[in-house]
């Protein structure tokens, strides 16, 4: 609404920078051939670029990325008993961000 | 993959808690009848519950919510000239979170 402005503080832009986000560890990352297992933990924290830029021609993009392998447990239930296996999932953390020009879509040839 | 576990640190669960997220200020929040304007800032930071819980029957939900009015600018370009107006948008911040049981979907009657 355009009224009752007195108590409203000025909105500050969410600048383009890294923020902590939650990444769900998909079972497909662990094993594409089998669905009868659980992954622990089901989600982890990652650093990702977010926020917005001054105009629509630029987007908040990572300029530096780091791959981080983490160890998870793959828990299979075999004859009602859990079998634990260790698996490595590679997470992608964004280390630095920048408002970058969005490349115009190339014409399909 | 199930190999090269030596350098992988144990994955830590992204616990259910408030995290800073980016909220895009939709133009529909300001004016549903007119599309010929910009909103500044286009996005702001909000606090939101995220993370995961111990099992699938529970979800990370806010237990305490606060509404926060903020002042944005509605920018119309009329005959190549900007006209600024002030508008208030009410943001929702999550103050506290909890892993809560997911209520079973009620049967449609």
């Amino acid at each position: 609404s355009l009224g009752s402005l007195t108590i409203a503080e000025p909105a500050m832009i969410a600048e383009c920078k890294t923020r902590t986000e939650v990444f769900e560890i998909s079972r497909r990352l662990i094993d594409r051939t089998n669905a009868n297992f659980l992954v622990w933990p089901p989600c982890v924290e990652v650093q990702r670029c977010s926020g917005c830029c001054n105009n629509r021609n630029v987007q908040c993009r990572p300029t530096q990325v780091q791959l981080r392998p983490v160890q998870v447990r793959k828990i299979e239930i075999v004859r009602k008993k859990p079998i634990f296996k260790k698996a490595t999932v590679t997470l992608e953390d964004h280390l630095a961000c920048k408002c970058e020009t969005v490349a115009a879509a190339r014409p399909v040839t | 993959s199930l190999g090269s576990l030596t350098i992988a640190e144990p994955a830590m669960i992204a616990e259910c808690k408030t995290r800073t997220e980016v909220f895009e200020i939709s133009r529909r929040l300001i004016d549903r009848t007119n599309a010929n304007f910009l909103v500044w800032p286009p996005c702001v930071e909000v606090q939101r519950c995220s993370g995961c819980c111990n099992n699938r029957n529970v979800q990370c939900r806010p237990t305490q919510v606060q509404l926060r009015p903020v002042q944005v600018r509605k920018i119309e370009i009329v005959r190549k000239k900007p006209i600024f107006k002030k508008a208030t948008v009410t943001l929702e911040d999550h103050l506290a979170c909890k892993c809560e049981t997911v209520a079973a979907a009620r049967p449609v009657t």
Epitope: N55 | L38, W40, R73, I75, P82, I83, F84, K85
Partner: antibody, heavy 123, light 106 residues
Framework: EVKLQQSGDELVRPGASVKMSCKAS????????MHWVKQSPGQGLEWIGT????????SYNQKFKGKATLTADKSSNTAYMELSRLTSEDSAVYYC????????????????WGQGASVTVSS | NIQLTQSPSLLSASVGDRVTLSCKGS??????LAWYQQKLGEAPKLLIY???NLQTGIPSRFSGCGSGTDYTLTISSLHSEDLATYYC????????FGAGTKLELK
């Protein structure tokens, strides 16, 4: 007190470029629009273009497109104008001036001006 | 583009005189007209905006009126410090200035 402080006078060679600044103080930089105006020796005033610092959007007088480039730095409350491929025709005093984009009675009026920056193009 | 024609281009007057400066637009300006005073070596100074609104800090001897294409600036009693060049400025459609009226001592 509203103040627009412009950079100093410039003596430049033909074909060169010059970038001048206009530092704003005494008001909220992003709540106003910045204009640039040219005044040739003994002549009247000519509007060059406008920048909306809040959203980094520019508008130019057709005559100055390709000649002037307007930018703004919100962090330092400073507007800039770069003039390229200078000729003797560009020798003039250049002013920055602000206008309010809020639709009140004083909307769009240049109510505060910089002191002016003289550019002399000479070989 | 709207053109503004100011008349006269040079006006000689004495201290205490009532002075009237004219500005004519090539099309309707819808009252979006302002007047500026410029002294030698100085930046223009806003006197009147939206045809007849006196800018804060400007003496009340300055007044403006007009509509459509025809506008005037009046100085009810000329002071020596009023000797300057006066420009009209339209901001209804784009931005244009008149060529100016130079006010000098008779």
């Amino acid at each position: 007190e509203v103040k627009l402080q412009q950079s100093g006078d410039e003596l430049v060679r033909p074909g060169a470029s010059v970038k001048m600044s206009c530092k704003a103080s005494g008001y909220t930089f992003t709540d106003y629009v910045m204009h640039w105006v040219k005044q040739s020796p003994g002549q009247g005033l000519e509007w060059i273009g406008t920048i909306i610092p809040l959203i980094d959007t520019t508008s130019y007088n057709q005559k100055f497109k390709g000649k002037a480039t307007l930018t703004a730095d919100k962090s330092s409350n400073t507007a800039y104008m770069e003039l390229s491929r200078l000729t003797s025709e560009d020798s003039a005093v250049y002013y920055c001036a602000r206008t309010s984009p809020y639709y009140y009675s004083s909307y769009d009026v240049m109510d505060a001006w910089g002191q002016g920056a003289s550019v002399t193009v000479s070989s | 583009n709207i053109q503004l024609t100011q008349s006269p281009s040079l006006l000689s007057a004495s201290v205490g005189d009532r002075v009237t400066l004219s500005c004519k637009g090539s099309q309707n300006i819808n009252n979006y007209l302002a007047w500026y005073q410029q002294k030698l070596g100085e930046a223009p100074k806003l006197l009147i905006y939206k045809t007849n609104n006196l800018q804060t800090g400007i003496p009340s001897r300055f007044s403006g009126c007009g509509s459509g294409t025809d506008y005037t600036l009046t100085i009810s009693s000329l002071h020596s410090e009023d000797l300057a060049t006066y420009y009209c400025y339209q901001y209804d459609n784009g931005y244009t200035f008149g060529a100016g009226t130079k006010l000098e001592l008779k």
